[in-house]
Interface confidence: medium
């Protein structure tokens, strides 16, 4: 039951993959790693990602071999730098070669880092908010994903996302306006459930 | 791991100069501010100069090296560089480079405790 139910998984994120894209992928990917290990580091998520959506790209081309060593070769970093990921991976990194990426992939979320700062500062207060944004928008927009997926183990991948999006959608708008604080400074009320 | 590495030290006169530039090897070091420090023989490593990565580019430097050091940074290299002019005896040293791990916003910090990632140090000697 166990597998087919990880099939299935496997197969919806084939299925996402190839409808939505490798962005939509990478963005998913940054909301749910940043649940699962709110301690690592952005740069360190990042990582995860890239090699996580290397892995799902060569699974569902079918590129089998391809697939199992590269998916191999990232539960072993993530087992070799468990300090600097999760404080919850230390089971699964004691289980066979086999075993360790499943037990990976369901690992429950680790506990989020006390004090973490308020997100305004960096994301609405900051007079730099636009020029960061315009200067790497994937990248900004990612931490803010990372920072706000962190810091809510509670919302789901897609509410995350959504709110994700209506962040970009702000800062494309306020960003060409006359003045662009002024336009964003709410934008944190829109995310109020 | 997350690399970062250091080159451009060497051997120069006093009041020569040096370019350091230190490399990231992850996009998403665009993010952090990045800092120079560096490590006399038998002294403590100590700040040098740092910069938010962002536009904006807040920029900071020891007291020692203000007005001849220049910090700056190219986002679409993943590379910061440290331009080192009249350089004196007391410049020697080992020069690390270091991401910081704080939020886009955050200035470069002085304290080594906010970086965590450190490049292996490039050798600058200047002879008298």
């Known amino acids: 039951d166990e597998g087919k139910a990880s099939s299935a998984k496997q197969r919806l994120k084939c299925a996402s993959l190839q409808k939505f894209g490798e962005r939509a992928f990478k963005a998913w990917a940054v909301a749910r790693l940043s649940q699962r290990f709110p301690k690592a580091e952005f740069a360190e998520v990042s990582k995860l990602v890239t090699d996580l959506t290397k892995v799902h790209t060569e699974c569902c081309h079918g590129d089998l071999l391809e697939c199992a060593d590269d998916r191999a070769d990232l539960a072993k970093y993530i087992c070799e730098n468990q300090d600097s990921i999760s404080s919850k991976l230390k089971e699964c990194c004691e289980k066979p070669l086999l075993e360790k990426s499943h037990c990976i992939a369901e690992v429950e979320n680790d506990e989020m880092p006390a004090d973490l700062p308020s997100l305004a500062a960096d994301f609405v207060e900051s007079k730099d908010v636009c020029k960061n944004y315009a200067e790497a928008k994937d990248v900004f927009l990612g931490m803010f994903l990372y920072e706000y997926a962190r810091r809510h183990p509670d919302y789901s991948v897609v509410l995350l996302l959504r709110l994700a999006k209506t962040y970009e959608t702000t800062l494309e708008k306020c960003c060409a306006a006359a003045d662009p604080h002024e336009c964003y400074a709410k934008v944190f009320d829109e995310f109020k459930p | 791991q997350l690399q970062v590495v250091e080159s451009g030290g060497g051997l120069v006169q006093a009041g020569g100069s040096l370019r350091l530039s230190c490399a990231a090897s992850e996009r998403t070091f665009v993010a952090y501010p990045m800092g120079w420090f560096r490590q006399a023989p038998e002294k403590e490593r100590e700040f040098v100069a740092g910069?938010?990565?962002?536009?904006?580019?807040?920029?900071d430097y020891a007291d020692s090296v203000e007005g001849r050091f220049t910090i700056s940074r190219d986002n679409a290299k993943n590379t910061a560089y440290l331009q080192m002019n009249n350089l004196k005896p007391e410049d020697t040293a080992v020069y690390y480079c270091?991401?910081?791990?704080?939020?886009?916003?955050?200035?470069?910090?002085?304290?080594?405790?906010?970086?965590?990632?450190w490049g292996h140090g490039t050798q600058v000697t200047v002879s008298s």
């Open positions: 270091a991401i910081s791990h704080q939020l886009p916003g955050g200035r470069p910090g002085r304290d080594m405790d906010s970086y965590s990632y």
């Open positions: 910069i938010s990565w962002f536009a904006g580019a807040t920029t």
